[in-house]
Each structure stands twice: as C-alpha cells, then as structure tokens.
C-alpha cells in the first residue's frame, strides 16, 4: 500500500515538475529588465530562450525570435540544450512510469518488470530535474555576471555629456518556475526509486534443510515468500505458504493517477 502511494505520488510530483520544466522553457521571462527603484517603466524589456520582448506603457507588446543559431551566445545554446534534454528525458520517464504504476495492469506484467521500469523512470526524472536545475542555474549565473558588468558601465558617454543608460537584466519568473519544477522532478524521481525498492518482494533463498527422523527420511522445506534483492530477478513470485496475508497485488486498486492529467 505504502509502495503504491509512494510510486503514485512520485509520478504525480514528476508530472507537475516536467510540466513546469516545459512551461519554463517556453516562457519569455527568463530575464527581465531591472527597474531599479522605479516600478513603472515606459519601455519594459524581457527575454526568453527563444525570443526577446518589449512591452510599452501603451500596452503594446512586441516579441522577436532569435532567428540566428550561430550568432547566439554559447551559454544560451547550452541552456537550451539542457532544458530540451530535461524535457525529453522527463517525457520518456513519464511514459515508462505510466506502465510501471501498480494501479495500472498491463497483461501479466510481473512485479520485477514493474520494479525495473519504476527505477528506470526514477533515474530519468532525477537526470531530467538535474538538467533543468543546471540549465536555469547556468542562465542565472550568466545574468549575475552581466548585471554587475553593466552596473560597472552603467553610464557611458562622450565626455560625460551624453548619457546612455545601459539596460540591466535581472532574474525573470521563468527561472523560479524552472528551479521549482526541476526540484519537483528530482523529488519525484527519488520517490520512484524508493518505491522501486519495495515493489519486488525480497527474495530470500532458503536452502532446503533435511531433518532425519529416526524412522523415515522426510525432507522438510521451510516456506515463505521468495523475495528479490536485486531488480534483475525474473523469478515467479510463488507462494508456498499462505498464512492469510495478502500480497501487494491483492490490495484494492485505486483510480489510476493518469486519469486526472
């Protein structure tokens, strides 16, 4: 029961995380114009991974895509790559984890196979979350570096006569969305890995012990559940002794988590 809950919760948390990573990647507000002490500005600049936008006090907003690929900074390309890798891994992880969910029955899929898939999706979620966190952090670092550089050169001009105010950029909403989403995906992945450990029952191979009675030679094999210690075990989970306990498979199934997506 706890394993199913952990797995289901891990799936939902990862799903929210990956949706957040996708949202952050698509958002235009990765960097926003620093407004200093002035909350109202006539021209407000903000930039995303794919385009830069300008919002005027008239309400008019104009966005322009970065139509060049080679002309873009290497750091921006790296951030794009990290976010895309994060999304792809997360999407594959979601697909795998759907089939791994205990509350979803697919033919006669064994617990060990589900455990394998749960671990695989968990690892994918962890890597996906790390990619997103890394991508957002690289971009944030780039912003901090540029912020202090532009602060140092805040006013440039010819002989101090003409001032050119350099636009400084600070953290945009997408960065916070990305950090939170990456964290959620990471947590979801860890939960999936934890759930995986409890999915396949522990395989304790007891050696058959022979007890020699005075008369007859009777071999007595102590019963119990075969449990897998590893994730690669493909042995059938045969029950030799049933003392009235129910296996995980016999617990009532709950509405599948993906019904609510």
């Amino acid at each position: 029961m706890a394993v199913t809950a952990c797995q289901g919760l891990g799936f939902v948390v990862s799903l929210i995380g990956i949706a957040g990573i996708i949202a952050a990647t698509c958002m235009d507000q990765w960097s926003t114009q620093d407004l200093y002490n002035n909350p109202v500005t006539a021209v407000f600049n903000y930039q995303g991974l794919w385009r830069s936008c300008v919002r005027e006090s008239s309400g008019f907003t104009e966005c322009r895509g970065y139509f060049t690929l080679l002309g873009l900074p290497a750091m921006l390309q790296a951030v794009r790559a990290l976010m895309i890798v994060g999304i792809v891994l997360g999407a594959i992880g979601l697909l795998v984890s759907i089939f791994a969910l205990k509350c979803i029955r697919i033919g006669s899929m064994e617990d060990s196979a589900k455990a394998n898939m749960t671990l695989t999706s968990g690892i994918m979620f962890i890597v996906s979350g790390l990619c997103a966190i890394a991508g957002v952090s690289v971009f944030a670092n780039m912003l901090v570096t540029n912020f202090w550089m532009s602060t140092a050169n805040m006013y440039t001009g010819m002989g101090g006569m003409v001032q050119t105010v350099q636009t400084r950029y600070t953290f945009g909403a997408a960065l916070f969305v990305g950090w939170v989403a990456g964290g959620l995906t990471l947590i979801g992945g860890v939960m999936m890995c934890i759930a995986c450990r409890g999915l396949a029952p522990e395989e304790t191979n007891y050696k058959a012990v022979s007890y020699h009675a005075s008369g007859h030679s009777v071999a007595y094999k102590p019963g119990g559940f075969k449990a897998s210690t590893g994730f690669g075990s493909n042995t059938k989970n045969k029950k030799i002794y049933d003392g009235g306990a129910r296996t995980e498979d016999e617990v009532q199934s709950y509405p599948s988590k993906h019904d609510y997506v």
Epitope: V40, V43, C53, S58, F60, Q163
Partner: antibody, heavy 115, light 113 residues
Framework: EVQLVESGGGLVQPGGSLRLSCAVS?????MNWVRQAPGKGLEWVAW????????TYADDFKGRFTISRDDSKNTLYLQMNSLRAEDTAVYYC???????????WGQGTLVTVSS | DIQMTQSPSSLSASVGDRVTITCKSS????????????LTWYQQKPGKAPKLLIY???TLESGVPSRFSGSGSGTDYTLTISSLQPEDFATYYC?????????FGQGTKVEIK
C-alpha cells in the same frame, strides 16, 4: 474609433482644487494628461494604466495632482489640489499608442488659476 | 529626467521648400531590446490639439502624408518635410517616449516666408 471628451475646467482661486474628467470611448490601455500653458509648449503631467490603475507623474505634479479612472463610467480623472497661477493651462487627455506616442487627444479644457 | 532640445525654435520657409527640424536628447532613446528609438514627433496648429506624425523615430502614423519623414538614432533625431505645403505651417514638437517622465522639446514654429 476612440473619442476623448474633457470637462471640468474653469476659473479657480490659488490654493483651490479642481477635478478634470475625460470621457473615453473605444479601446484604451493607458491614458495621459498633458497640459499647455498659454503661448507655451507641451508639458506631460501624468500617465495611468487603465486596467490596473497604476499611475506615474512628472516630478512637478507629484503630491499635488492625482490621476485616476472609473472603470464603470469609462472615465479618466485628474484631481488637482493646491493650484497655483502657473498651473493655468489647457489640459488635454491623450491615449498612449504603440511607440508610446499619443495618437488620440481630447479637445482640451482650460483651467485658469487666478484671484 | 531626459531633456529634449529642439532647433531651430522657429523658421521661415516657402511652399515647396524642404524643411528639417532637429531634436537632441540628453540620453539615448534607443531601446536595446528591440533596437527602436522612442522618439515621437507632433504637429500642432493654433487652438487645436497636437497631432501624432511619427513614432519610433521613423514610423509614419497612418493618415500622415508621406512628405513627412523621421530619422535618427541614439540622441540625435530629425524631422524632414520634403516639400512644404500650406497646411504644414504649424508648431512641431519632439517627445521622449522612452522613459518616464515623458518630456517634450520646446517646439519649432514653421512660418510662411
């Protein structure tokens, strides 16, 4: 088609108050008040976001003038307090257009501050 | 605040003349985000409200005759009337549309010679 009609101008004594209105028809995201003293140039007074009500003012008018709007009446206001003789001018309301220019203007309302 | 300085303050010209009015700002009006200069030009006739002619330094407002053109970037801008018409005799203002407070130039009065 946007139409702007100002009202509320008139004669007021120094230190007095006056509220100007601008009836707005048509789409406006943000609005401005601009004034022009007799024989002088244009002077921007204040701006307001018609959706959020967020205002900003020219330094000379902060604390004395208040720009506001009434959503239900689709009207823009300029509350002017502590009026001085130098506030005598024609006051225009104007809509902000792309490029932050003012594309639609009212006909103007004259405010005279005199004792 | 950004100061706007127009020159000349007045000029006399004849119909058909090419007229140039310059406007200088104390700070650059060029926005790095979209590479547009936030300078606006207006025409005002006596007793009337100003009329928008040009925004983004060079974009002609709809309905404005093509004889009007704007140019410039950074801190130096120009309004040109290629062939002055009788209805063009008026006062012209430039405006900083880049940052609050919006500021206007003192105006250039175009009179008949």
């Amino acid at each position: 088609e946007v139409q702007l009609v100002e009202s509320g101008g008139g004669l007021v004594q120094p230190g007095g108050s006056l509220r100007l209105s601008c009836a707005v028809s048509g789409y406006t995201f943000s609005m401005n008040w601009v004034r022009q003293a007799p024989g002088k140039g244009l002077e921007w007074v204040a701006w307001i976001n018609m959706y959020t009500g967020e205002p900003t003012y020219a330094d000379d008018f902060k604390g004395r003038f208040t720009i506001s709007r009434d959503d239900s009446k689709n009207t823009l206001y300029l509350q002017m307090n502590s009026l001085r003789a130098e506030d005598t001018a024609v006051y225009y309301c104007a809509r902000t257009a792309p490029g932050n220019g003012f594309d639609y203007w009212g006909q103007g309302t004259l405010v005279t501050v005199s004792s | 605040d950004i100061q706007m300085t127009q020159s000349p303050s007045s000029l006399s010209a004849s119909v058909g003349d090419r007229v140039t009015i310059t406007c200088k700002s104390s700070q650059s009006l060029l926005n790095s985000g979209n590479q547009k200069s936030y300078l606006t030009w207006y025409q005002q006739k006596p007793g009337k409200a100003p009329k928008l002619l040009i925004y983004w330094a060079s974009t002609l407002e709809s309905g404005v005759p093509s004889r009007f053109s704007g140019s410039g970037s950074g801190t130096d801008y120009t309004l040109t009337i290629s062939s002055l018409q009788p209805e063009d005799f008026a006062t012209y203002y430039c405006q900083n549309a880049y940052s609050f407070p919006f500021t206007f130039g003192q105006g250039t009065k175009v009179e008949i010679k």
